[in-house]
Interface confidence: low
């Protein structure tokens, strides 16, 4: 973006323009209109005749010289005024915008120009005085005048060389600006190289993070396996105890047979007397299949079955259809209970859904739907909601009417795009709709302007990713 332009403007002034970054320096040098070209009949550096001239010729000659002097004087005054006017403006701009080195050069040039112009003006004043005196005594001083005109011509030549010097200084400044441009380009290249190196580092870190995430997933899987083994052991122990108690009761009829109790949801757990928050084993309706869920026995009267929790980003929610079907994560931390269980449960009786949200500024809000159920897998676990109340927006951030569930490998949304792939996580996407509580988890100070984050539009608006979310269900008649 540094450039240098040299052109003629419409009035015939020579224009020098130096562009450097946001600074633009323009030198308008007026041409000496009345200075004769080499093709004109009078040649300024012609050899003077020593013999006295005819009076009339002399007068004519002097008038020509006087005109030249007058024109030169006017031209120099114009140049001086122009420099004085423009240097004031230029100095202010230069002081504000230019590099220190450049400023120094410009001030130096300005000072030199002013000094030289003043000097030339003084010289011209002296010369003019001499010429005026000589004209009154022309008849007596023709020979002396001949020498004087010679001196005047020499001064005109000096002024011309001064102008050439000025132009040389301009071209020197030109070169300096171009050199600065080259230096700037080199600096930009090195910055770009550093940036590229940083990007390589970032991509390396990303791959390390991905590896770590995979290891965490593996660890979670291993943990689940261990929990399953522990569960199986407990079952075996219970069976043994049952067998023992059965044989004992056969011998002693007074000992009653211990009943094995199963719970469908946390409301049943609560009603059975277990009023402490924690993980409980629930049984699928009309089945012996079991699932572990976290029960909130304190909030709003207790008995809440937690079906989703986000709190720290420790679990990857960009999962497959099958994983969202059966559930994943850790019930004591971040987890998804499972669409199949929730679908079966909510089709047995009427349930309410409460969604509790936290932002990064310490605010909390909730949305409560007085009727909630999920369709079967055949109908893509479509969500059905009615009767919204709460503080997290007067409008439902889960699009109404309900949409089918979508995952990265099961695109059932209403968009040409694949919402789940784009926004990450499985959700009841519309096209793509104003919410996604299973999006990417973003930490504080990185949680704004993120469209694939944890969204609840009608509470926090676009691009805000929440700190924590909990989705919980409870029978409507609890």
């Amino acid at each position: 973006y540094n450039n240098f332009r040299k052109s003629m403007d419409s009035i015939g002034k020579k224009q020098y323009q130096v562009q450097h970054g946001s600074c633009s320096y323009t030198f308008l040098l007026p041409e000496m209109d009345n200075c004769r070209s080499s093709s004109s009949p009078y040649v300024s550096n012609a050899v003077q005749r020593d013999a006295p001239l005819e009076y009339d010729d002399s007068v004519q000659r002097l008038q020509v010289l006087e005109n030249i002097m007058e024109n030169n004087t006017q031209w120099l005054m114009k140049l001086e005024n122009y420099i004085q006017d423009n240097m004031k403006k230029e100095m202010v701009e230069i002081q504000q915008n230019a590099v220190q080195n450049q400023t120094a050069v410009m001030i130096e040039i300005g000072t030199n120009l002013l000094n030289q112009t003043a000097e030339q003006t003084r010289k011209l004043t002296d010369v003019e005085a001499q010429v005026l005196n000589q004209t009154t005594r022309l008849e007596l001083q023709l020979l002396e005048h001949s020498l004087s005109t010679n001196k005047l011509e020499k001064q005109i030549l000096d002024q011309t060389s001064e102008i050439n010097k000025l132009q040389d200084k301009n071209s020197f400044l030109e070169k300096k600006v171009l050199a600065m441009e080259d230096k700037h380009i080199i600096q930009l290249q090195s910055i770009k190289e550093e940036k590229d190196q940083l990007q390589v580092l970032v991509s390396k870190q990303n791959s390390i993070i991905e590896e770590l995430e995979k290891k965490i997933v593996t660890a979670t899987v291993n943990n689940s396996v261990l929990q399953k083994q522990q569960h199986d052991l407990m079952e075996t122990v219970n069976n043994l105890l049952t067998m023992m108690s059965t044989s004992n009761s056969a011998k002693d009829p007074t000992v009653a047979k211990e009943e094995q109790i199963s719970f469908r949801d946390c409301a049943e757990v609560f009603k059975s007397g277990h009023t402490t928050n924690g993980i409980y084993t629930l049984t699928f309706p009309n089945s012996t299949e079991e699932i572990k869920a976290y029960c909130d026995m304190e909030a709003g009267g207790g008995g809440w079955t937690i079906i989703q929790r986000r709190e720290d980003g420790s679990v990857d929610f960009q999962r497959t259809w099958k994983e969202y079907k059966v559930g994943f994560g850790n019930p004591s931390g971040e987890y998804w209970l499972g669409n199949e269980f929730v679908s079966q449960l909510t089709n047995q009786q009427r349930y309410v859904l409460k969604i509790h949200l936290k932002d990064w500024e310490g605010n909390e809000a909730y949305s409560l739907y007085e009727h909630f159920y999920l369709s079967s897998e055949e109908l893509n676990y479509r969500i059905h909601l009615k009767g919204l109340t709460g503080t997290a927006g007067k409008i439902s951030s889960i699009s109404q009417p309900g949409n089918d569930f979508s995952t990265k490998d099961g695109d059932n949304d209403k968009c040409i795009c694949k919402c789940s792939q784009m926004l990450t996580g499985g959700w009841w996407f519309d096209a793509c709709g104003p919410s996604n509580l299973n999006g990417m988890y973003y930490p504080q100070r990185q949680n704004t302007n993120k469209f694939n984050g944890i969204k609840w539009y009608y509470w926090k608006g676009s691009g805000y990713s929440l700190k924590a979310t909990t989705m919980m269900i409870r029978p409507a008649d609890f």
Epitope: I395, C417, D430, N449, F451, K460, S462, G463, Y464
Partner: antibody, heavy 122, light 107 residues
């Protein structure tokens, strides 16, 4: 039918002030984030400011930060842009635009007003 | 801030021809990109969002592609009303940034 009508443009002195309004109709104004975008004569589009549906989130372009203030009056379905310390480079056509609620769209401006012209000159 | 570089600044084409306008983002923005059309003296209109999704009422001759940092808008079988200006906008983060625009001219 969604309609956005800007007003308040005109001639302003450098260093002066001007308040633009945008009257919205045909949709539930309080549900949508709103933006101001400007376009200098014969130039491209330049984003100015954003306000969320409930006014809890506000953003500005660096060029106007500290000089312009975006606000809204949801009951009156009106968006405002208070401009102070105006400069010649603020001369432009100012559009108000509605942001889509679709998450997949991000900050997509799905409806725009016809614009109001602001000229800053002495 | 994310810089959006749009090219070409202007392009000449004939009726019925196809043209492609490109937009480069200074950092990866996934598919968070929109294209707008602006007719002289009018306000911009949304053409494409999410890099590839066509906005309501937009003719199918307009199509968007790309992800990450490189995006393009293709207009096939140009009609007379298509010879206007087009802008790309990143939708990913504030400040919202918009390309300098491409003016489509009739040959």
């Amino acid at each position: 039918d969604v309609q956005l009508v800007e007003s308040g443009g005109g001639l302003a002195q450098p260093g002066g002030s001007r308040k633009l309004s945008c009257a919205a109709s045909g949709f539930t104004f309080s549900n949508f984030g709103m933006h101001w975008v400007r376009q200098a004569p014969e130039k491209g589009l330049d984003w100015v400011a954003y306000i969320s549906s409930g006014s809890d989130t506000i953003y500005y372009a660096d060029t106007v930060k500290g000089r312009f203030t975006i606000s809204r009056d949801n009951p009156k379905n009106t968006l405002f842009l208070q401009m102070t310390s105006l400069r010649s480079e603020d001369t432009a056509m100012y559009y108000c635009a509605r942001e889509s609620t679709m998450i997949t769209m991000g900050y997509v401006l799905d409806y725009w007003g016809q614009g109001t012209s602001v000229t800053v000159s002495s | 801030d994310i810089q959006m570089t749009q090219s070409p600044a202007s392009q000449s084409a004939s009726l019925g021809e196809s043209v492609t306008i490109t937009c480069l983002a200074s950092q990866t923005i996934g598919t968070w990109l929109a294209w707008y059309q602006q007719k002289p003296g009018k306000s911009p209109q949304l053409l494409i969002y999410a890099a590839t999704s066509l906005a309501d009422g937009v003719p199918s001759r307009f199509s968007g592609s790309g992800s990450g940092t490189k995006f393009s808008l293709k207009i096939s079988s140009l009609q007379a009303e298509d010879f206007v200006s087009y802008y790309c906008q990143q939708l990913y983060s504030i400040p919202l940034t918009i390309g300098a625009g491409t003016k489509l001219e009739l040959k």
